[in-house]
């Protein structure tokens, strides 16, 4: 319904009456509406609701609502729907992060490495090599390095010392007679290799083809490891031909870890499947909901003088 009543708190905008050339000061329309008729000397401005597929975020004096962004492309998920007050916002599903309007999987930290910083919907996981006294025995994008089992606290001894990839193995030593001593091979200290710690910020993946300079005929090229900006590197043990390609040269300090990332580093999803996509369902696996206020580029750079 058109709305004519002006709130005391609402702002104003200037409008030139085309008929008289007079500059009029009109009340702005509330967010979610637009000015369907400007005020005159004798009448208030008239506000109408934004049609489906359009929005205005703020009170305004504009004659047409902004078009909502396109439906989220699969597999992105709709974080905020297109509504009278809000533009559509897309985000990546759990386990992925947004990079140049596509989704890339969170890096899986390999065995011997743990998560230093959790991945988010906009940032990749960062991995670090397990420090002295810690280990990681499974590849994971969520698990930190775990501390070795404390054998002594269980009245046991270390039969086999832990490494970056394995826990201590505890056991009981056979009782020795006074004339015997423990075999020289019985180790009870971590290996010296645990004295150093390497941190690897995980790869910042830019999906294939995100570079505007990429030629249509370019085949996949394995990325370079930017060794000057990382202390350690994760070994690349993938047999997939596709790596993390086309790291965007405009982003400074990208740290690329070259491990087991294949073509799926060209992916994307939906939180509330967008109106355009069908069949998206959240599985019963509990997953934290998305954070509000996900930063995204405002596609509507109109900044009309009569808006805000």
């Amino acid at each position: 319904q058109p709305e004519q009543k002006a709130s005391n708190l609402i702002g104003t905008y200037r409008h030139v009456d085309r008929a008289t050339g007079q500059v009029l000061t009109c009340d702005k329309c509330p967010a979610g509406t637009y000015v369907s008729e400007h005020c005159t000397n004798t009448s208030l401005r008239v506000c109408s609701s934004c049609p489906v597929g359009t929005f205005t975020r703020h009170e305004n004096g504009i004659e047409k609502c902004h078009d909502c962004s396109q439906p989220c492309p699969w597999p992105m998920i709709e974080k905020l729907p297109c509504a009278a007050l809000t533009d559509r916002e897309c985000t990546c599903p759990p386990g992925m992060f947004q990079s140049n309007a596509t989704c890339a999987p969170h890096t899986v930290c390999p065995v011997g490495w743990g998560v230093r910083k959790k991945g988010t919907e906009t940032e990749d996981v960062r991995c670090k090599q397990c420090a002295r006294g810690t280990f990681s025995d499974v590849p994971s994008s969520v698990m930190k390095c775990k501390a070795y089992t404390d054998c002594l606290s269980q009245n046991l001894v270390v039969i086999k010392p832990g490494t970056k990839e394995t826990d201590n193995v505890c056991g009981t030593l056979p009782s020795f007679s006074s004339s015997t001593s423990p075999s020289p091979g019985t180790a009870i200290f971590p290996r010296p290799e645990h004295m150093e710690t390497h941190e690897v910020p995980s790869s910042t993946y830019v999906p294939k083809g995100m570079n505007s300079t990429e030629s249509n005929s370019s085949a996949s090229v394995r990325p370079k490891v930017l060794s000057s900006i990382q202390e350690g590197t994760v070994p690349d043990n993938t047999s997939s031909a596709r790596g993390k390609e086309d790291v965007n040269k405009t982003l400074p300090n990208l740290q690329v870890v070259n491990h087991q990332q294949g073509p799926h580093h060209r992916h994307i999803l939906k939180l509330l499947p967008s109106m355009e996509a069908t069949g998206g369902e959240k599985s019963s696996t509990p997953i934290k909901g998305p954070k509000r206020g996900h930063p995204r580029q405002n596609l509507h750079k109109h900044f009309d003088i009569n808006e805000h």
């Epitope: 386990g95 294939k208 087991q260 294949g262 799926h264 060209r266 939906k270 959240k282």
Partner: antibody, heavy 116, light 113 residues
Framework: EVQLLESGGGLVQPGGSLRLSCAAS????????MNWVRQAPGKGLEWVSS????????FYADSVKGRFTISRDNSKNTLYLQMNSLRAEDTAVYYC?????????WGQGTTVTVSS | DIQMTQSPDSLAVSLGERATINCKSS????????????LAWYQQKPGQPPKLLIY???TRESGVPDRFSGSGSGTDFTLTISSLQAEDVAVYYC?????????FGGGTKVEIK
């Protein structure tokens, strides 16, 4: 070598159930969106279902929604498709495929025949 | 749903000649935020699974010969084989991955004339 190997197909009566498996090797399975695509004899390709890397989101074709369930076990590098209330029109070769910006790795397929 | 329509259904081309396959989507698969077309092309030979040739409408998959190229934007796309070889005899499919349900074209059978 990057490989996908489907299993679990066979002959089943209408209304019956089957569970397909797809064993992945040679890549970090837990980082990839995975899909099931089918192909009826002499026909084209039809997308069936997809699941995101974490398993938290699933997508289905309307023709199988409510009857088929896609799932994955990242610790076993395995993708599954539980097919219930099977119909004659579900007869096809079922492929498991990796990826979403183009499916770049496909298995050899497993044949499902629904017939009385 | 986005419908994908391929033409022609079949195509006979002499060895060394150019083969052109068209694919039309019922809605645009171009996403303006990244200026990418969410379209892929596959090749399927008898008794084999499909093989990815092109993604993002024009980016060739690793290991695919450069005689294969993809072009087009929005709703109209083309797969071109610049110089047909005997091993290119197959059925070719386009596929959109802009929205679910993911949909394939009906396929184009390419044969040697």
């Amino acid at each position: 070598e990057v490989q996908l190997l489907e299993s679990g197909g066979g002959l089943v009566q209408p209304g019956g159930s089957l569970r397909l498996s797809c064993a992945a090797s040679g890549f970090t399975f837990s980082m990839y969106i995975m899909n099931w695509v089918r192909q009826a004899p002499g026909k084209g390709l039809e997308w069936v279902s997809s699941i995101v890397s974490s398993g938290g989101w699933t997508f289905y074709a309307d023709s199988v929604k409510g009857r088929f369930t896609i799932s994955r076990d990242n610790s076993k590098n395995t993708l599954y498709l539980q097919m219930n209330s099977l119909r004659a029109e579900d007869t096809a070769v079922y492929y498991c495929a990796r990826g979403h910006y183009g499916m770049d790795v496909w298995g050899q397929g497993t044949t499902v025949t629904v017939s009385s | 749903d986005i419908q994908m329509t391929q033409s022609p259904d079949s195509l006979a081309v002499s060895l060394g000649e150019r083969a052109t396959i068209n694919c039309k989507s019922s809605r645009s698969v171009l996403y303006s935020s990244n200026n990418k077309n969410y379209l892929a092309w596959y090749q399927q030979k008898p008794g084999q699974p499909p093989k990815l040739l092109i993604y993002w409408a024009s980016t060739r998959e690793s290991g695919v010969p450069d005689r294969f190229s993809g072009s087009g934007s929005g709703t109209d796309f083309t797969l071109t084989i610049s110089s047909l070889q005997a091993e290119d005899v197959a059925v070719y499919y386009c596929q959109q991955y802009y929205s679910t349900p993911l949909t394939f074209g009906g396929g184009t059978k390419v044969e040697i004339k």
